[in-house]
Every structure is written in structure tokens, then in C-alpha cells.
């Protein structure tokens, strides 16, 4: 079953997904899609990266972390109830059926109506936007590397507890990521 993540209407939602590039700049294509991961690629793609950059995106969906270091966690801006559902993060490691697939369930709750200020689970401050330019391009899969046999579904559970960039770095350093090479 999918690991569950929660956000409130009007907030930014954060869906974690990481891998470790074999070498700096040796990136693996990744796609994010709305809906569970199908056989190939992602269904209803909302964002794609290739080995260099983000080459496809739709409004409100972006990568807040440093995707060049393997942080391909998805941020969805200003969520509504319609954003609820399963999302697929697919790390397209080259080879014979090497793709890593993660299905993450996003649950959107109605905004709390309260006069008292509450701490929003908004990851924008914790993960300042790294992208300055994003361009459309063909959705190609051009990568290098190989994948060892590592079960990393726990990444989602750990990442669910992220609150700041220090914890993000702790998680990444802990080895709960896909390591390529």
C-alpha cells in the first residue's frame, strides 16, 4: 500500500523522492505523475527531468530541492481537494527493467478555521527553490549507471517526517536513498 502524506487546502504539499547520482552531474531521468505508476514512465505526467534539467512541467508542480544531487521531491503549490490521490515518482535507471517506482498517497484536508496562528506544513522555506530556468524539451531517457539490489521503500516513511533542510540532509546522508553506481 502507498505511504500517506497530508496537507491542508491552501498549503504546499511535499512528496519525497530521492536517489544518489553515481557521480556529480550523472543524473537519472525522473518522472512524476498523478496516478499510480504504470508499466512505463508515469501516467498523467506533471513533471519530468532528463540527465540535465527539468524538461517538462505543469503549473504548481516543481522541484524545491537540488535535483542535481538526487533530491527529486515534488512540491505542489496551493493545494486543493482535487489534488488528493496517488502520485508516482519513477526513477528511470538504465538497464533491463531497472526502474524504481514509488507510489505516494496525498491526502488533502480542509483548511482549519481558527483565529489562533498555526504552523503550516509548508516546505517552501525549508527547501528554497533551486531552479531558475526551466524549459520544455523532448521527454527522453538518457542516463548512465546501474542499480544495486536495495529495498528503499522506507525512504517515504522517513521523509514524511522532514521539517527542515537539516533533516533532509540527515536523511540523505543516512543512506535511505537509491544509490546508483
Amino acid at each position: 500500500s502507498e505511504v500517506e502524506y497530508r496537507a491542508e487546502v491552501g498549503q504546499n504539499a511535499y512528496l519525497p523522492c530521492f536517489y544518489t547520482p553515481a557521480a556529480p552531474g550523472n543524473l537519472v531521468p525522473v518522472c512524476w505523475g498523478k496516478g499510480a505508476c504504470p508499466v512505463f514512465e508515469c501516467g498523467n505526467v506533471v513533471l519530468r527531468t532528463d540527465e540535465r534539467d527539468v524538461n517538462y512541467w505543469t503549473s504548481r508542480y516543481w522541484l524545491n530541492g537540488d535535483f542535481r544531487k538526487g533530491d527529486v521531491s515534488l512540491t505542489i503549490e496551493n493545494v486543493t481537494l482535487a489534488d488528493s490521490g496517488i502520485y508516482c515518482c519513477r526513477i528511470q535507471i538504465p538497464g533491463i527493467m531497472n526502474d524504481e517506482k514509488f507510489n505516494l498517497k496525498l491526502v488533502i484536508k480542509p483548511a482549519k478555521v481558527t483565529p489562533a496562528p498555526t504552523r503550516q506544513r509548508d516546505f517552501t522555506a525549508a527547501f528554497p527553490r533551486m531552479l531558475t530556468t526551466r524549459g520544455h524539451g523532448p521527454a527522453e531517457t538518457q542516463t548512465l549507471g546501474s542499480l544495486p539490489d536495495i529495498n528503499l521503500t522506507q525512504i517515504s516513511t522517513l521523509a514524511n517526517e522532514l521539517r527542515d533542510s537539516r533533516l533532509a540532509n540527515d536523511l540523505r546522508d543516512s543512506g535511505a536513498t537509491i544509490r546508483i553506481g
Epitope: 496516478g35 499510480a36 508499466v39 512505463f40 514512465e41 533491463i96 527522453e140 531517457t141
Partner: antibody, heavy 123, light 107 residues
């Protein structure tokens, strides 16, 4: 006009090898996943193998991946299927198919098919 | 592997009839289902993808519905050119798998 034309089929003895080719035209070949699907005489469709845009990611029916190899040459707009250690049960029409694609979609279904090439494995 | 079971295996109908073909998956495949039409000696033709989206150029008398494990292909008013074999295909789990086919014949 999108066209897919398979070739390379024929009669081969059990244990033999064949290399099927699929010549693509009418579209930007390197933008599409490509797939081989086969159909034994009088039977249904069976997925064989698929390959991503640049050939670095391949997918196979488990029972075939030790004997069959899918590849592509984007410079030649061509898809290939190398079939080794052929068996009688590999007898079928082999279709080359294009994975449907546009920005935001996934290539998991096939919008254009070739007319197929018949492979017969018999002694 | 995900098993796809079509019913009926064969069906006789007349021009103008409304026809429904069903496809059942052995596990949840969400809406990752495709329908193809195949005529004798020809390659399959894409009809419907993602369970309900009509492929380009396919007449509106064809429609698809369902999600999860149960799906249907409906032809609202059969035309002579619709007599063929129909296949469903799931694209949620590896390997891609097809139903065994439903042969639609003229009554």
C-alpha cells in the same frame, strides 16, 4: 503518414536465430517508446519487449529475456528484435508498435502498428 | 502477472445492436486499460486508452468505462465494419498483458 514496416521473418529450425527489423517513418522516431508484440496463429496478443526513447531502458516478458534482445538505432529510424534459441512456441506474427506519446502522457498503449512479419520455427 | 479475462469469448449480433464486452483484471489496475480492435489478417487498432478516452479517429459509437478491476467496451449501434476481434490490455503491472479476445460476429 506514420508507417512501421517489419522484416526479417521466415522459417527457422528449433535452436536457430533470427533478427527482426522494423523500419519507421513519418514521425520523430527518437521521441517514442517502441514495442514488439506477437500473435501465435489463431491465438491472442502477447507482449514481447519494449524499449525507451534512447535505448537505455528495456523491458521484457520474463520468459523471453534470456533469449530475446530488443534494440534500436535512432539514426536509422529502426527497431530490432534479436531472437536466439528459437522454439516451436515462438512461432507467431511479430508486430512492431509505437507507444502513444505526447507531453504529459505515458507510452503504455500502442497507437500505430506494423502489419507484422511471420516467424515459423519448425524442423 | 495480472490476468485479464474477457467475456464473452464470442458474440453474435446484428447491425444496429448495442453490444457490451467486459474485461476483468485479476487485481486493481486503476484506469490503466486499453481496448484494441483487430480484423483478420490485419494489425490491431487502438480504440480506447486509460479505460475511457477515445483514440483519435475512432467513431463516437465506441465508449469505454470502468476502473479498478472491471471494465466495459460498448458499441452503441453496430456497423458492418465493427465485426472483428476486440482485445483489452492492462498497462499497470509488468508484464503488459492482454485479454484472450472477444470475437464479434454477424448474426
Amino acid at each position: 503518414e506514420v508507417q512501421l514496416v517489419e522484416s526479417g521473418g521466415g522459417l527457422v529450425k528449433p535452436g536457430g536465430s533470427l533478427r527482426l527489423s522494423c523500419a519507421a517513418s513519418g514521425f520523430t522516431f527518437s521521441d517514442y517508446y517502441m514495442t514488439w508484440v506477437r500473435q501465435a496463429p489463431g491465438k491472442g496478443l502477447e507482449w514481447v519487449a519494449s524499449i525507451n526513447y534512447d535505448g537505455r531502458n528495456t523491458y521484457y516478458l520474463d520468459s523471453l529475456k534470456s533469449r530475446f534482445t530488443i534494440s534500436r538505432d535512432n539514426a536509422k529510424n529502426s527497431l530490432y528484435l534479436q531472437m536466439n534459441s528459437l522454439r516451436a512456441e515462438d512461432t507467431a506474427v511479430y508486430y512492431c508498435a509505437r507507444g502513444y506519446y505526447y507531453y504529459g502522457s505515458s507510452p503504455n498503449y500502442f497507437d500505430y502498428w506494423g502489419q507484422g512479419t511471420l516467424v515459423t520455427v519448425s524442423s | 502477472d495480472i490476468q485479464m479475462t474477457q467475456s464473452p469469448s464470442s458474440l453474435s449480433a446484428s447491425v444496429g445492436d448495442r453490444v457490451t464486452i467486459t474485461c476483468r483484471a485479476s487485481e486493481n489496475i486503476y484506469s490503466y486499460l486499453t481496448w484494441y480492435q483487430q480484423k483478420p489478417g490485419k494489425a490491431p487498432k487502438l480504440l480506447i486508452y486509460n479505460a475511457k478516452t477515445l483514440a483519435e479517429g475512432v467513431p463516437s459509437r465506441f465508449s469505454g468505462s470502468g476502473s479498478g478491476t472491471d471494465f466495459t467496451l460498448t458499441i452503441s449501434s453496430l456497423q458492418p465494419e465493427d465485426f472483428a476481434t476486440y482485445y483489452c490490455q492492462q498497462h499497470y503491472g509488468t508484464p503488459l498483458t492482454f485479454g484472450q479476445g472477444t470475437k464479434l460476429e454477424i448474426k
